[in-house]
């Protein structure tokens, strides 16, 4: 057992173009709230789908009111950290949905509205007991940052929090299926791994695989009460001491509510109170409906008129995912041909183009040589993107306009003489050396 | 299409209690605002309380703070309001309302309406 923290840290405009100043209006004071839905593995982050390892709303933050002309401020949070506890081990790898909403404080009589303001949502590896990890994520307009981190509950302890610490000074019994605790204070020793499908409640092993049940439950798995027609009670094994019957399994064991849901026996099954934004027998439905605005970035929300009914998002172009929360780069794809640059401007893809080559994706190679002249009789040659001059001896340069000194890079070898001519250069070989440049 | 039914009304004495329900069919009450509305003879129809019920966020009016409480039952699929320390001008048709994009107490936001159930407070 232990519980999953979530700090935020702060919520506002993105960086770049056309974020929005605040989620507030002049007109229409405001306030922000938060809540998040955690599942266990790197499940599919659908809305839908039930929070199985819990959800937790923040309070409200402070009333926000945008003052015409001023700089945009950091929006006022509520206080405190969203707190999910999670009974069983922690899973490791878990997807988030964090949800901002907005309450607009309307008129006294007209009361406030609610809206889905933006909804952001991952796949994480988290070690319980670690530090806090940080995330900045985006939803179109708006950028979340948070921190979050999982702990666990004495006595567990360990990644998973399925390791049971008893320390020193405890009584040394551990309980049904925990080995004694190790002699160091705080140490201890996972527990066993019984028989498969040994009741938690009523059985326990001192070896591995096996089920040893408590007073008053048997069967392999320790599973079926062992009765007795003495008491009135209608269920449950007797009791060693009494003779009477104490509570057996019941329709709650366990507790078949999902996410935080509170059981409750009728007579002839259960009920499960949900906690507020689920629903259905077990509480395993989250409901999000079109009405709550799941559709980002200008996303066209079908179905979904009621919590039953699944809504789809139709996104814009440029964007994808189940809400239309993921920008799609578009330019992961190469789409600029010939070495050009890809510019993302959101509402369309432009290509910079290296030189020499044109059009929409850089896909026209240019004639670099059109309307460029190589002067002092140079030859221009295409290629690259970009033209270059063959220079006639004596000239150099871009365009052969540079008057060259052929003898500058020392061409004669062996202490020959260089001696510039019109028609490039002549070597004056020293005593013992010949060939145009007195290589031999 | 969802189906409100309202029940629970009566006639009470001033200072009595009453609770009424509000069962949706047809579809989950999960996840939208709800609300309480009330209309006495030849008044407007005046927002009491609402509730988001994805969320457990309540709003009340001043004349029933207090007094009156908005709270939800998914298992049931009910939207309730327990009215207490009731007054002879609590008297009126009491209506409960759902799904609406606009403030929650205001009337002409609600897209669907039940039939509505009595109150009647007597001196």
């Known amino acids: 057992a232990g519980v999953f923290e979530l700090q935020i840290h702060s919520f506002g405009p993105g960086p770049g173009p056309g974020a929005p100043r605040s989620p507030c209006s002049a007109r229409l004071p405001c306030r922000l709230f938060f809540r998040v839905c955690l599942k266990p593995g790197l499940s599919e982050e659908a809305a839908e789908s039930p929070c199985a390892l819990g959800a937790a709303l923040s309070a409200r933050g402070p009333v926000y009111t945008e003052q015409p002309g001023a700089p945009a401020p950091d929006l006022p949070l509520p206080d405190g950290l969203l707190q999910v506890p999670f009974r069983d081990a922690w899973p490791g790898t878990f997807s988030f949905i964090i949800e901002t909403w907005r309450e607009e404080l309307g008129d006294q009589i007209g009361g406030p509205a609610w809206s889905l303001l933006a909804r952001v949502a991952g796949r994480r590896r988290l070690a319980a007991g670690g530090p806090w990890a940080r995330d900045i994520q985006r939803a179109g307009a708006w950028e979340l940052r948070f921190s979050y981190r999982a702990r666990c509950e004495p006595p567990a302890v360990g990644t998973a929090c399925t390791r049971l610490c008893r320390p020193r000074s405890a009584p040394s019994r551990c309980g049904p299926g925990l080995r004694p605790c190790a002699p160091l204070e705080d140490e201890c020793e996972a527990p066993l791994v019984c028989r498969a499908g040994c009741s938690p409640e009523h059985g326990f092993c001192e070896q591995p695989g096996e089920c040893r049940c408590l007073e008053g439950w048997t069967g392999p798995l320790c599973t079926v009460p062992v009765s007795t027609s003495s008491c009135l009670s209608p269920r449950g094994p007797s009791s060693a001491t009494t003779g009477c019957l104490v509570p057996g399994p019941g329709p709650c064991d366990g507790n078949p509510c999902a996410n935080g849901g509170s059981c409750s026996e009728t007579p002839r099954s259960f009920e499960c109170t949900c906690p507020r934004g689920f629903y259905g027998l077990r509480c395993e439905v989250s409901g999000v409906t079109c009405a709550d605005g799941p559709c980002f970035n200008g996303g066209l929300c079908v179905g979904g008129a009621d919590p039953d009914s699944a809504y789809i998002c139709h996104c814009p172009p440029g964007f994808q995912g189940s809400n239309c929360e993921k920008r799609v780069d578009r330019c992961s794809l190469q789409p600029c041909r010939n070495g050009g640059l890809c510019l993302d401007l959101g509402h369309a893809l432009r290509c910079r183009c290296r030189a020499g080559f044109a059009g929409p994706r850089c896909e026209h190679d240019l004639d670099d040589c059109a309307g460029r002249a190589c002067a002092n009789g140079g030859t221009c040659v295409e290629g690259g993107g970009a033209h270059r001059c063959s220079c006639a001896l004596g000239f150099g340069g871009r365009d052969c306009r540079e008057r060259a000194d052929p003898c500058a890079a020392r061409p004669c070898a062996h202490g020959g003489r260089c001696y510039a001519h019109f028609s490039g250069l002549v070597c004056a070989c020293a005593p013992g050396y010949m060939g145009a440049r007195c290589e031999f | 299409q969802v189906k409100l039914v309202e029940s629970g009304g009566g006639s009470v004495q001033a200072g009595g209690s009453l609770r009424l329900s509000c069962a949706a069919s047809g579809s989950t009450i999960s996840s939208r605002p709800m609300a309480w509305f009330r209309q006495a003879p030849g008044k407007e129809r005046e927002g009491v309380a609402c509730?988001?019920?994805?969320?457990?966020?309540?709003y009340y009016a001043d004349s029933v703070k207090g007094r009156f409480t908005i709270s939800q039952d998914n298992a049931k699929n009910t939207v309730y309001l327990q009215v207490n320390s009731l007054k002879p001008e609590d008297t009126a048709m009491y209506y409960c309302a759902a799904d609406s994009r606009r403030p929650c107490m205001v009337a002409a936001g609600y897209t669907y309406w039940g039939q509505g159930t009595q109150v009647t407070v007597s001196s």
């Open positions: 509730i988001h019920t994805g969320l457990g966020r309540t």
